[in-house]
Interface confidence: medium
């Protein structure tokens, strides 16, 4: 669908909070992957009954994707070839390059809690160095 993509300001820290904010974002933390391979970025919001209305995925200051409760997924045009939605609210990065190394943020917009932000650091290594076991997979 014709989705107007805004400029993105990456979030940092561990989220904001509503007056009853109890949730926490669980992420994979620091992960590594092979150059040319794929990786799943995954965050999980737990310990809250808040409704998730939207999840943004960003690489530092660039918007990668939006998963909106009403509209579904949108991938930013500049990442369409290498980013796939899911599984779930996660994001799959494909054809990794060394330039993909850096911070990634999941920003959960929830009601009534507010905004929760999770951080993942991805290091893309030459294939002989990457730790295969560091990849995160959804059970």
């Amino acid at each position: 669908y014709p989705y107007d993509v805004p400029d993105y300001a990456g979030g940092g820290g561990s989220g904001g909070g509503g007056s009853m904010m109890t949730g926490t974002i669980e992420t994979t933390g620091n992960i590594s992957a092979e150059k040319g391979g794929s990786i799943i970025l995954q965050c999980h919001l737990s310990s809250t009954t808040a409704q998730v209305t939207q999840v943004n995925w960003a690489q530092q200051d660039q918007l990668l994707a939006i998963c909106n409760a009403d509209l579904g997924w949108h991938i930013s045009p500049s990442f369409k070839d290498r980013v796939a939605p899911g599984p779930g609210l996660g994001l799959t990065l494909q054809s990794l390059t060394v330039n993909d190394t850096g911070e990634y943020f999941c920003i959960y917009h929830t009601y009534p809690d507010g905004t929760y932000t999770g951080r993942i650091f991805l290091e893309v290594l030459e294939s002989s160095v990457a730790e295969h076991g560091a990849r995160f997979q959804i059970p």
């Epitope: 107007d4 009534p112 905004t115």
Partner: antibody
Framework: EVQLVESGGGLVQPGGSLRLSCAAS????????MHWVRQAPGKGLEWVAF????????YYADTVKGRFTISRDNAKNSLYLQMNSLRAEDTAVYYC????????????WGQGTMVTVSS | DIQMTQSPSSLSASVGDRVTITCRAS??????LAWYQQKPGKAPKLLIY???TLQSGVPSRFSGSGSGTDFTLTISSLQPEDFATYYC?????????FGGGTKVEIK
């Protein structure tokens, strides 16, 4: 060019009702959450209500909950605010505003419509 | 609800001056703060969101900083068209709340 045009304001007696409309153009209305924000004469801004792009999420300020109803018709590119049981303190300019796709900041606003509640 | 407190409520400045407006939240809002400019009889205009990101089309003399509870809007060199009222708004949580405004007047 993004345009938001409010209408439906006017003078109403306490306890009365009004329905405000906001006509949107210049963007894909069905992709954006929308807000109503009001401003009493000589005062600051007060958020009133929000509706998500597909109407699945609707939130209200406590001051209007149970009296105001926000709705939208994506086929008509229109946003509405049904205001019932109006009080003098509801007197204000009412603005419709578009929500950014990524955050709950409001990137485009209409010119506003004045609602006066007085006997 | 989160209370947003702006200071000063008004200030007088001259063209070319550096102007700083502060906004304090009653609790942490991470970096999720927006700044708006409003001129008399007009609708507000978004200047900055997410604390420091300039809205498209806004002159670079406007900048925002801060996180947690304390935020600042800076106009590096005040221009004639910048005389207006400025509002902060937290967009971290429901209900979204605004500061009381800062009126920037000509000295």
């Amino acid at each position: 060019e993004v345009q938001l045009v409010e209408s439906g304001g006017g003078l109403v007696q306490p306890g009365g009702s009004l329905r405000l409309s906001c006509a949107a153009s210049g963007f894909t209305f069905s992709n954006f959450g929308m807000h109503w924000v009001r401003q009493a004469p000589g005062k600051g801004l007060e958020w009133v209500a929000f509706i998500s792009s597909g109407s699945s999420s609707i939130y209200y300020a406590d001051t209007v909950k149970g009296r105001f109803t926000i709705s939208r018709d994506n086929a008509k590119n229109s946003l509405y605010l049904q205001m019932n049981s109006l009080r003098a303190e509801d007197t204000a300019v009412y603005y419709c505003a578009r929500m950014r796709l990524d955050y709950y900041a409001m990137d485009y606003w209409g010119q506003g419509t004045m609602v006066t509640v007085s006997s | 609800d989160i209370q947003m407190t702006q200071s000063p409520s008004s200030l007088s400045a001259s063209v070319g001056d550096r102007v700083t407006i502060t906004c304090r939240a009653s609790k942490s809002i991470s970096k999720y703060l927006a700044w708006y400019q409003q001129k008399p009889g007009k609708a507000p205009k978004l200047l900055i969101y997410s604390g420091s990101t300039l809205q498209s089309g806004v002159p670079s003399r406007f900048s925002g900083s801060g996180s947690g509870t304390d935020f600042t809007l800076t106009i590096s060199s005040l221009q004639p068209e910048d005389f207006a009222t400025y509002y902060c708004q937290q967009h971290n949580e429901y209900p979204w709340t605004f500061g009381g405004g800062t009126k920037v007047e000509i000295k």
